[in-house]
Interface confidence: low
Amino acid sequence: KKEDGESTAPTPRPKVLRCKCHHHCPEDSVNNICSTDGYCFTMIEEDDSGLPVVTSGCLGLEGSDFQCRDTPIPHQRRSIECCTERNECNKDLHPTLPPLKNRDFVDGPIHHR
């Protein structure tokens, strides 16, 4: 709930945003922090054995509006969430895997597409 007198205007995007990065850290990152003119993201996807893997990092401004608004196709088993409101905001993002849709099944382990 907003406190009385608190502005309801959206927080302007910082010129340089710092994000937590995990599995998507650039070589020059320090302490698992990357910097971007765009968005922080957290993503969950399945690995080859069907286990969920969470990664996080920075998305550049160019093209990231499309990425972040683009909820993945359900059967991709991948979901990405983005934020810009403060530094390291992606620590608080918790995307969930969408359900299976039109997955190809083979004998034994699940075959991805």
């Epitope: 990092g57 998305l59 550049g60 160019e62 093209g63 683009d70 993945p72 359900p74 849709k101 597409r113």
Partner: antibody, heavy 116, light 113 residues
């Protein structure tokens, strides 16, 4: 600014392998979530999705053509490739590449004619 | 596979007329987790590549005139042009991006009466 451009052989004979290249700028296939797809359109007919590739090298194919299709990418050179084996005259079409899974950006298309 | 059916296959219209065209899917395109319909509409003019008009069934792509409106949910969708202009004469395709294989409708051709 996102641009995509397809290139191909123009004409080839039945039973040959069709090799297509999609060269793009303004997007990177190393960006998490990014994907590029191939769609074709025979003259005067509708659109048919062929194949898709994601930044992490996941691939998806049209089941009706899967045995003949191979999609691949060269991330560093901003290119995606499609090969169609054992072409027949019914593969004559304009071939497009496009970004994403709802296709906000398309190339201009390249016409491929399969003729003996 | 999800089958997309469009009607009518062609439509003769006069400039200034209101036009509606239909797209039906063989299964629901509504994803309950985010309440979004995974449906897009494209316009293709002769000799040109298709152009994205509408995504999420009703969201207008940037730069698309507001005379184009997408509506519907689940399996029944409609594209409406409130007042047709000569430049709107084209073929209109719907496409589902709910699951692979991605599929298109056969198109509705808009012609001058």
């Amino acid at each position: 600014q996102v641009t995509l451009k397809e290139s191909g052989p123009g004409i080839l004979q039945p039973s040959q392998t069709l090799s297509l290249t999609c060269s793009f700028s303004g997007l990177s296939l190393s960006t998490p979530g990014m994907s590029v797809g191939w769609i074709r359109q025979p003259s005067g007919k509708g659109l048919e999705w062929l194949a898709h590739i994601w930044w992490n090298d996941d691939k998806s194919y049209n089941p009706a053509l899967k045995s003949r299709l191979t999609i691949s990418k060269d991330t560093s050179n901003n290119q995606v490739f499609l090969k169609i084996a054992s072409v027949v005259t019914a593969d004559t079409a304009t071939y497009y590449c496009a970004r994403g899974d709802r296709f906000a950006y398309w190339g201009q298309g390249t016409l491929v004619t399969v003729s003996a | 596979d999800i089958v997309m059916s469009q009607s009518p296959s062609s439509l003769a219209v006069s400039v200034g007329e209101k036009v509606t065209m239909s797209c039906k899917s063989s299964q629901s395109l509504l994803y309950s987790n985010n309440q979004k319909n995974y449906l897009a509409w494209y316009q293709q003019k002769p000799g040109q590549s298709p152009k994205l008009l509408i995504y999420w069934a009703s969201t207008r792509e940037s730069g698309v005139p507001d005379r184009f409106t997408g509506s519907g949910s689940g399996t029944d969708f409609t594209l409406t042009i409130s007042s047709v202009k000569a430049e709107d004469l084209a073929v209109y395709y719907c496409q589902q991006y709910y699951s692979f294989p991605l599929t298109f409708g056969a198109g509705t051709k808009l012609e001058l009466k």
